[in-house]
Amino acid sequence: YPNASPLLGSSWGGLIHLYTATARNSYHLQIHKNGHVDGAPHQTIYSALMIRSEDAGFVVITGVMSRRYLCMDFRGNIFGSHYFDPENCRFQHQTLENGYDVYHSPQYHFLVSLGRAKRAFLPGMNPPPYSQFLSRRNEIPLIHFNTPIPRRHTRSAEDDSERDPLNVLKPRARMTPAPASCSQELPSAEDNSPMASDPLGVVRGGRVNTHAGGTGPEGCRPFAKFI
């Protein structure tokens, strides 16, 4: 089973999407060009993220298309900012025992959430599902990101960084077992979704991880086939 965490080393090159999930639905965190942050039921170019891990479990999350950092204000509101403020734009990442990831501000202690309520993170707590995230590899064709290629100066035309300025073409993968109590491969949610209705294949599937099991902070949230 792929690793629950999107943090595959100190600077993982691949694009990922963070999404919340219940038994029936899921929302992908997206950072819009105007800095607004919300959730979408499917992968979008604005939900494609790069997550850089730093020391002591801190992470920096960036929206690739908006070119904005995910940040949080003192009230717990999340927003995208072009300016990186270490106090507001770094989050503590923690993987819960159910295999889901939570992100909270070390400065203000609020959880990153797609719900509207602002809740402080407390060790051992069982956050609501819209504050717990899983990660999924990007499935949107890179052409949709329309990233301008920088002008070449002295570098060779074969230079990888020239052809792939965002370093997204060759994401590294790491396979580790999910918690034993949680590991359960689930059917793809595309089973009942014909390609005709999703030609880009951006709505479901390609999950980096799936978990199932009991409820509560010690167990795993019910995780049926969501759409």
Epitope: A40, P41, N126, P129, Y130, N192, S197, V203, T215
Partner: antibody, heavy 117, light 106 residues
Framework: QVQLVQSGAEVKKPGASVKVSCKAS????????MHWVRQAPGQGLEWMGI????????SNAQKFQGRVTMTRDTSTSTVYMELSSLRSEDTAVYYC??????????WGQGTMVTVSS | AIQLTQSPSSLSASVGDRVTITCRAS??????LVWYQQKPGKAPKLLIY???SLESGVPSRFSGSGSGTDFTLTISSLQPEDFATYYC????????FGPGTKVDIK
């Protein structure tokens, strides 16, 4: 402002099917799941199912498996709920409701479906 | 599936009364609980989300509390327009509703 406008009341015979529509406006249609909830006369609210607005994928409550079909038309920002093999117990008001991640924040006005021979 | 129970199923109260309605989940649902108000012939109206957050435009006399399995909706001073049926709903693993509590005039 967000609005969900449903189709008018229907009277159907047992065994027939009914198709109720819900037209959304005032927001980006593909950014929110849509739900269907029904309420029999004098009874409580009963969740029926959910549709993903961009893929058309659906997930229904066990009770309605095989009898309910939810579809959507993104060009008109409309979702549809068709219930087949109607019986008298299906007499109810049917609501569409928008998913706001942490609640159903906007509801249609409801469509009364009466099943009677 | 997680089941929700509400108590009481109905209650009679007077204008100005403090009213408390409880909702209990069969398993822990964190704070993923919602309260709605419904009046006859109308669609439900969102009051409280995430167990305790007041929806925009809802009077402050409404409040919610609880986490895990036990939740409460409180109306601090009942007003004439508050006579209605109140439903809880969980957003944790499914979207089922409680059976409702009818608040009528004493």
């Amino acid at each position: 402002q967000v609005q969900l406008v449903q189709s008018g009341a229907e009277v159907k015979k047992p065994g027939a099917s009914v198709k109720v529509s819900c037209k959304a406006s005032g927001y980006t249609f593909t950014n929110h799941y849509m739900h269907w909830v029904r309420q029999a006369p004098g009874q409580g609210l009963e969740w029926m199912g959910i549709i993903n607005p961009i893929s058309g994928s659906t997930s229904n409550a066990q009770k309605f498996q095989g009898r309910v079909t939810m579809t959507r038309d993104t060009s008109t920002s409309t979702v549809y709920m068709e219930l087949s093999s109607l019986r008298s117990e299906d007499t109810a008001v049917y609501y569409c409701a928008r998913d706001a991640v942490d609640a159903f924040d906007f509801w249609g006005q409801g469509t009364m479906v009466t099943v009677s021979s | 599936a997680i089941q929700l129970t509400q108590s009481p199923s109905s209650l009679s109260a007077s204008v100005g009364d403090r009213v408390t309605i409880t909702c209990r989940a069969s398993q822990g649902i964190s704070s993923a609980l919602v309260w709605y108000q419904q009046k006859p012939g109308k669609a439900p109206k969102l009051l409280i989300y995430d167990a305790s957050s007041l929806e925009s435009g809802v009077p402050s006399r409404f409040s919610g509390s609880g986490s895990g399995t036990d939740f409460t909706l409180t109306i601090s001073s009942l007003q004439p327009e508050d006579f209605a049926t109140y439903y809880c709903q969980q957003m944790y693993d499914d979207f089922n509703f409680g059976p409702g509590t009818k608040v009528d005039i004493k």
